[in-house]
């Protein structure tokens, strides 16, 4: 990043430094340290104080965004004296040049698209680059396939999500020969950005009095089990008057996904389709293909 780091410190400095790649704040260890603490303050005056590392001369910030600018602060007491130092981390570059309207979504269980728009004051030669770091191994993923608009990167397609974890840090850097470009960063939960496929293997079997609908839970990127799903069934009688209410049935995920409903012979032609959602978010998938049952002369 092309961010200026400005230090505000008394004469005997702790030499505080920040590595944005590892989110690690470190300083020179002092002999006979009795107390140390580090924290950051963001533009909204929110304070984040991480745990100190074992050596007590560094700390790592886990879940922070830096694009609005932050101030790091380190306090150290030794048996002789106290030290205090601030480190300003501004988002340098011309205001309004950073990528904006950034969003990502996971689809088909193992694909992800991220998109953004060029900043309103960005010069014509601006180029953006996306980097993703997972929360666990701090591994960095560089965008493998960019989506372009007139030569400018405005999106990214990933077809290998193995490096992601449940929460990930996204950074869009910018470059230009003319001026400094601000960066944009964001933390995204995979569970909030995944769009499920509809349920698969939908079948309907009827006897003289009932019909049984069965289906399989969709394959997902997230590690989900059966209780994490909520389903909606749309059982629809064909050839009914426009405006007739469809019967929408909510069904909780189960080891065997099934819904049994009364429907006696002779039965009119019906269709059923199913969609799925995460039970906690209810971000519905598209509907499955409609399955027809019953007869026209029912």
């Amino acid at each position: 990043e092309k961010s200026d780091l400005r230090t505000v410190a008394p004469a005997s400095s702790l030499n505080v430094r920040f590595d944005s790649r590892t989110m690690n704040l470190s300083w020179d260890c002092q002999e006979n340290t009795t107390f140390s603490k580090c924290f950051l303050t963001d533009k909204k005056n929110r304070v984040v104080e991480p745990r100190l590392s074992n050596n007590e001369c560094s700390c790592t910030f886990r879940e922070i965004c830096l694009h609005e600018g932050v101030t790091f602060e380190v306090h150290v007491n030794t048996s002789q004296r106290g030290f205090q130092q601030k480190l300003l981390y501004p988002n340098s570059g011309r205001e309004g040049t950073a990528a904006q309207n950034f969003s990502c979504f996971i689809y088909n269980a193992d694909l992800m698209n991220c998109t953004w728009a060029r900043g309103p004051t960005a010069p014509r030669d601006v180029q953006y680059f996306l980097y993703i770091r997972n929360s666990k191994r701090r591994r960095e993923i560089r965008c493998p396939y960019y989506i372009q608009d007139s030569g400018t990167h405005v999106g990214c397609h990933l077809d290998n999500l193995s490096g992601l974890t449940s929460r990930n840090y996204f950074l869009v850097n910018g470059t230009s020969r003319e001026i400094g470009i601000q960066f944009f960063d964001s933390l995204l939960d995979t569970k909030k950005i995944e769009r499920f496929n509809p349920p698969s293997n939908v079948t309907v079997r009827c006897n003289t009095t009932h019909c049984l609908v069965r289906w399989k839970q969709p394959r997902t990127y997230q590690k989900l089990s059966y209780l994490d799903f909520q389903y909606q069934l749309d059982v629809h009688r064909k050839n009914t008057q426009p405006g007739t209410e469809n019967l929408l049935i909510n069904v909780s995920g189960d080891l065997e996904n099934r819904y049994n409903f009364p429907s006696s012979e002779p039965r009119a032609k019906h269709s059923v389709k199913i969609r799925a959602a995460d039970v906690r978010i209810l971000n519905w998938s598209s509907w499955s293909e409609a399955i027809e049952f019953g007869s026209d002369d029912g």
Epitope: T165, K223, S225, L227, D228, L255, R280
Partner: antibody, heavy 120, light 111 residues
């Protein structure tokens, strides 16, 4: 109807090992995650470990690490728990269970339990 | 000593409402992790009653409800019935212990 059928009660001497089996019927084990929990009158329920899809491996509770092994034979839809170097305080009912949700771990269906008694 | 604290027993007359509390800490319920509740009838295996704080698996009557706030959770049983007499356990994950943890259990007696 999905069921978990566990092996019968065991009586073991201190220092010995015990292997408890858990047979799944009505569903394929390869599509499920099995975890093991034990229950004692003094300590209540203790989670022992099970398959973690995030790590793509079986993870064990710290306090049982080194003494416990969990294995699976998907060809016969059976999961196994082996606990070695048994002590008298390992006397407990051991349950296998199917994970209903991973975040956080929620045990959706339980076996009937296997009583293991450790006594000299 | 269980990581999650529950009252050892509660009781109520048939038709009444009883609640069971489950108190944790900032490393488990307050982390925040979802809470699940299990019912164990005498001499049987536990059965899942509530998951994701307040969701009921299919087959569990709506007389059972639960909620979570801060570092504690509670289970409510309305219209108490004789066959609700059982031990009830709360459970969640504890990040300090890196695994699932349970409450010590609450015996519900129907008077």
């Amino acid at each position: 109807q999905v069921q978990l059928v566990q092996s019968g009660a065991e009586v073991k001497k201190p220092g010995a090992s015990v292997k408890v089996s858990c047979k799944i019927s009505g569903h394929s084990l390869s599509e499920l995650s099995i975890h093991w929990v034990r229950q004692t009158p003094t300590k209540g329920f203790e989670w022992m470990g099970g398959f973690d899809p995030e790590e793509n491996e079986i993870v064990y509770a710290q306090r049982f690490q080194g003494r416990v092994t969990m294995t699976e034979d998907t060809s016969i839809d059976t999961a196994y728990l082996t606990l070695s170097s048994l002590r008298s305080d390992d006397t407990a009912v051991y349950y296998c269970s199917i994970v209903g949700s991973f975040s956080p771990l929620t045990l959706g269906l339980w076996g009937k339990g296997t009583m293991v008694t450790v006594s000299s | 000593q269980a990581v999650l604290t529950q009252p050892s027993s509660v009781s109520g007359a048939p038709g009444q409402r009883v609640t069971i509390s489950c108190t944790g800490s900032g490393s488990n319920i307050g982390a925040p992790y979802d809470v699940s509740w299990y019912q164990q009838l005498p001499g049987t295996a536990p059965k899942l009653l509530i998951y994701h704080n307040n969701k009921r698996p299919s087959g569990v009557p709506d007389r059972f409800s639960a909620s979570k706030s801060g570092t504690s959770a509670s289970l409510a049983i309305t219209g108490l019935q004789a066959d609700d007499e059982a031990d009830y356990y709360c459970a969640t994950v504890d990040e300090a212990l890196s695994g699932s943890v349970f409450g010590g259990g609450t015996k519900v007696t129907v008077l």
